[in-house]
């Protein structure tokens, strides 16, 4: 019972820290001792340093009362636990003054990290680690640490799949402090987007710690948990350019204006998400490939905006594809080509259906943003035209998993509607039999964002051929 | 019946929650234009630790203003249920876990500035956006209070699924865990490996939801 009270209290403290983070500009900008990478068994000592710190309201505006109340709550004594009692008698923990001092924003971030760590430790102390015959706990270090990053959405992946062990990831800039993420996870990936978007021009290093599953206090033979470093990663120079999309084309006489969609990234400035163009500015260019629908001879043009104005022959239909390029880079300079868009395609009933499918997909994407659905779904990211119906059926099947796991009525309705639309359009082609195509279960499992992106691309294939 | 804790929030979940959800459901269309609306009410009244009772008391009072809107009978009925029901439940001693006396014991201003605003001005604030947000905050605040009464409820070990294993990180209420197909087996497309620790409201016993997972060779 006391343990549960302790857990509730710790969660409440996290809420209070989160609330104070909203008022960070109303706090006295004083540097306060902010423990990070706290030694094992010194968590309670570090916790008391956070509590003792002189966090103060700057006495400006209407928020003073709410800030003072929150600070008061932070300083309340938490319910005692065995671990806490044990640590209070440990004399070897660093003094509060020896910890690095940080302004309120970082102070609160570090306090939250410590609270999360303490909750995880508390949870894991209820289970038991696996031991080998000698009675010591076995863990293996992570390996093959790989950065997967597109348009700044950045995930660190590693191996192996854990057996009786869990992982915690840390990330830092070359000169910065380590920040822990994905505490005690059984996943072999960790989304570090939130960290890298703070400054995409910095160079980051991550490391993955391995702990025995039931006993995160226990460490490797040297008394330190095993860990492995990632390669260095500079988002601005290395994030892959996502596949661009042609937003529109408009013909006036012998000129055609082709517009490329300005992809939104997860990089924020002043609380708004920046587009790819906002982030890269003139460093980003687009190459347009265009050709007469009736021939294969391609022409090309470039722009450092998102628009092309090209000359065409009157009475001819053209097809277009674009590629994003960052000329100043030496690797990862180019995106894959956008789906092909052609002039003069009849917007028949089924094409209209597919267009509606895309807007339903966008709606689903918006709705799930606030939910934590960590499902991975079978995704065909490189659909061969001769297998597009088979691939589409897999996408529709897997879409139902999103509906199931969200438990959200409007997602459920949107998915249902989308499946009806897609099936109507598919049945309009008669019963197409495609051979030599992959079974759904043979496809790679991807996260929901990538799944939905690939889904949009296959729908565009249907639009282009309907 | 005031014994919400004993029945684990049954009164709230079978009466108030139903009405709140009905109201929110009927306001589904509202929202896209409300994204940037800032309402002073929520800056001044927050469902904060040890202030839940006060927040709900004020929010319930605020709801009454919306009864005068010429909406359908059903809508008004649900609003009345939420407003009156919240007030009644708050008056149940001990309901807001020792917080109520302190919260309601505070001196009450005769009328808050917010309430003095004319309905015309309220219109400017965008009635429906405010109402929707108010209902969402009330729901969240009640959930926060009642979460406390459910914290200690845990699930038994989850059921077994053919050709799959599960490693449970947490047995507590609302935990979400995943089964993993055994080596040589793959999740059948369209099936979900997720299971969730949920509460059976009738028996007040927690159980894991049945995953739709099928593991195939």
């Amino acid at each position: 019972q006391g343990q549960d009270r302790h857990m509730i209290r710790m969660r409440q403290l996290i809420d209070i820290v989160d609330q104070l983070k909203n008022y960070v500009n109303d706090l006295v900008p004083e540097f306060l001792p902010a423990p990070e990478d706290v030694e094992t068994n010194c968590e309670w000592s570090a916790f008391s340093c956070f509590q003792k710190a002189q966090l103060k309201s700057a006495n400006t505006g209407n928020n003073e009362r709410i800030i003072n109340v929150s600070i008061k709550k932070l300083k309340r004594k938490p319910p005692s636990t065995n671990a806490g009692r044990r640590q209070k008698h440990r004399l070897t923990c660093p003094s509060c003054d020896s910890y690095e001092k940080k302004p309120p924003k970082e102070f609160l971030e570090r306090f939250k990290s410590l609270l999360q760590k303490m909750i995880h430790q508390h949870l894991s102390s209820r289970t038991h680690g696996s031991e080998d015959s000698s009675g010591t706990t076995n863990t293996v270090a992570a390996y093959n640490l790989t950065w997967k990053s597109t348009n700044f959405k950045t995930i660190l992946e590693w191996e192996p799949k854990p057996v009786n062990q869990v992982y915690t990831v840390q990330i830092s800039t070359k000169s910065g402090d380590w920040k822990s993420k994905c505490f005690y996870t059984t996943d072999t990936e960790c989304d570090l987007t939130d960290e890298i978007v703070k400054d995409v021009k910095q160079t980051y290093l991550a490391r993955v710690f391995s702990y025995p599953a039931g006993n995160v206090e226990s460490t490797g033979s040297a008394g330190e948990p095993l860990y492995e470093n990632s390669p260095e990663f500079t988002p601005y120079l290395e994030t892959n350019l996502g596949q661009p999309t042609i937003q529109s084309f408009e013909q006036v006489g012998t000129k055609v204006n082709v517009t490329v969609e300005d992809e939104r990234t997860l990089v924020r400035r002043n609380n708004t998400f920046l587009s790819l163009r906002d982030v890269f500015g003139k460093d980003l260019i687009y190459t347009l490939y265009y050709w007469k629908s009736s021939s294969s001879g391609k022409k090309t043009a470039k722009t450092n905006t998102n628009e092309f104005l090209i000359d065409v022959d009157k009475g001819e239909n053209y097809c277009f594809s674009v590629q994003a390029v960052i000329p100043s880079r030496t690797v990862n300079r180019k995106s894959t080509d956008s789906p092909v868009e052609c002039m003069g395609q009849e917007k028949g009933e089924f094409r209209e259906n597919w267009v509606n499918v895309i807007s339903d997909l966008k709606k689903i994407e918006d709705l799930i943003q606030s939910m934590h659905i960590d499902a991975t779904l079978y995704t065909e990211s490189d659909v061969h035209p001769s297998c597009k119906v088979t691939a589409m059926k897999c996408f529709l099947l897997e879409l139902q998993v999103i509906s199931l796991e969200s438990g959200d009525a409007s997602i459920h309705d949107t998915v249902e509607n989308l499946i009806i639309l897609a099936n109507n359009s598919l049945s309009s082609n008669g019963n197409v039999t495609e051979s030599g195509c992959k079974e759904c279960e043979e496809l790679e499992e991807k996260n929901i964002k990538e799944f939905l992106q690939s889904f949009v691309h296959i729908v565009q294939m249907f639009i282009n051929t309907s | 019946d005031c014994d919400i804790e004993g029945k684990d929030g049954k009164q709230y979940e079978s009466v108030l929650m139903v009405s709140i959800d009905q109201l929110l459901d009927s306001m589904k269309e509202i929202g896209s234009n409300c994204l940037n609306n800032e309402f002073n009410f929520f800056k001044r009244h927050i469902c904060d630790a040890n202030k839940e009772g006060m927040f709900l008391f004020r929010a319930a009072r605020k709801l009454r203003q919306f009864l005068k809107m010429n909406s359908t009978g059903d809508f008004d009925l649900h609003l009345l249920k939420v407003s009156e029901g919240t007030t009644i439940l708050l008056n149940c001693t001990g309901q807001v876990k020792g917080r109520k006396p302190a919260a309601l014991g505070e001196a009450q201003p005769t009328k808050s500035l917010e309430e003095n605003k004319s309905l015309k001005e309220q219109k400017k604030l965008n009635d429906l956006c405010f109402l929707k947000r108010l209902l969402q905050e009330i729901k969240t605040c009640w959930n926060k209070i009642l979460m406390g009464t459910k914290e200690h409820i845990t699930c038994p070990p989850p059921m077994s699924v053919e050709h799959a294993d599960i490693w449970v990180k947490s047995y507590s209420l609302y935990s979400r865990e995943r089964y993993i197909c055994n080596s040589g087996f793959k999740r059948k497309a369209g099936t979900s490996s997720l299971t969730e620790c949920v509460l059976n409201k009738a028996t007040n016993v927690a159980h894991w939801t049945t995953p739709s997972l099928k593991c195939i060779r």
């Epitope: 490939y289 391609k298 043009a301 470039k302 090209i310 390029v325 000329p327 880079r329 030496t330 180019k334 | -």
Partner: antibody, heavy 117, light 107 residues
């Protein structure tokens, strides 16, 4: 360091074909297009076309369609240009060059193709 | 197709002189223009890209200016090794045409 090394000069009879190679080193081959440029004796530079090793797309000048065929072998980081139905006016120095999108920053040393009966 | 008209076709100057070559595009090409130098029997060498940017390792006496349809290339103080043929090239849209060249000779 970055280098583009072209195959040696060739003497061909009219009507024959010739394949000129351009081996790239010192950079990520698929990240840059390879351009081909012709310079006839005593004349200026003429753009033939380019190939994008990343996606295999080729773009040709109208004057060289059917005359030049551009290909790449990604495994050896080599670009090729095949010239068919050679005539005496195809006698020239042929250059390959690396495209950095805004210009051609590294050039091969040039391959002289002589067409003579 | 975009035509590039380079002038003059040839030019005599002395060491230390300031010389300017112009290049005119038949339609707007924004700043998608490059300048190259070529010596007899050698490959062309990049001097200026994106109309105004100096390529790596190129001396600062070389400069480029202009955008849209009118471009110029300047050598502020001629050095003996600068006597060669200079080409402009538009890299805006295919075919990526070159100017006909300007031969810079010693007076």
């Amino acid at each position: 360091q970055i280098q583009l090394v072209q195959s040696g000069g060739e003497v061909k009879k009219p009507g024959a074909s010739v394949r000129v190679s351009c081996k790239a080193s010192g950079y990520s081959f698929t990240d840059y297009n390879v351009y081909w440029v012709r310079q006839s004796p005593g004349k200026g530079l003429e753009w033939i076309g380019y190939i994008d090793p990343y996606n295999g797309i080729t773009i040709y000048d109208q004057n060289f369609k059917g005359k030049a065929t551009l290909t790449v072998d990604k495994s050896t980081s080599t670009a090729y240009m095949e010239l068919s139905s050679l005539r005496s006016e195809d006698t020239a120095v042929y250059f390959c060059a690396r495209d950095v999108t805004t210009a051609l920053d590294f050039w091969g040393q040039g391959t002289t193709v002589t067409v003579s009966s | 197709d975009i035509q590039m008209t380079q002038s003059p076709a040839s030019l005599s100057a002395s060491v230390g002189d300031r010389v300017t070559i112009t290049c005119l595009a038949s339609q707007t090409i924004d700043t998608w223009l490059a300048w190259y130098l070529q010596k007899p029997g050698k490959s062309p060498q990049l001097l200026i890209y994106a109309a105004t940017n100096l390529a790596d390792g190129v001396p600062s006496r070389f400069s480029g200016s202009g955008s849209g349809t009118d471009f110029s290339f300047t050598i502020s103080s001629l050095q003996p090794e600068d006597f060669a043929t200079y080409y402009c090239q538009q890299v805006y849209s295919s075919p990526f045409t070159f100017g006909q060249g300007t031969k810079l000779e010693i007076k």
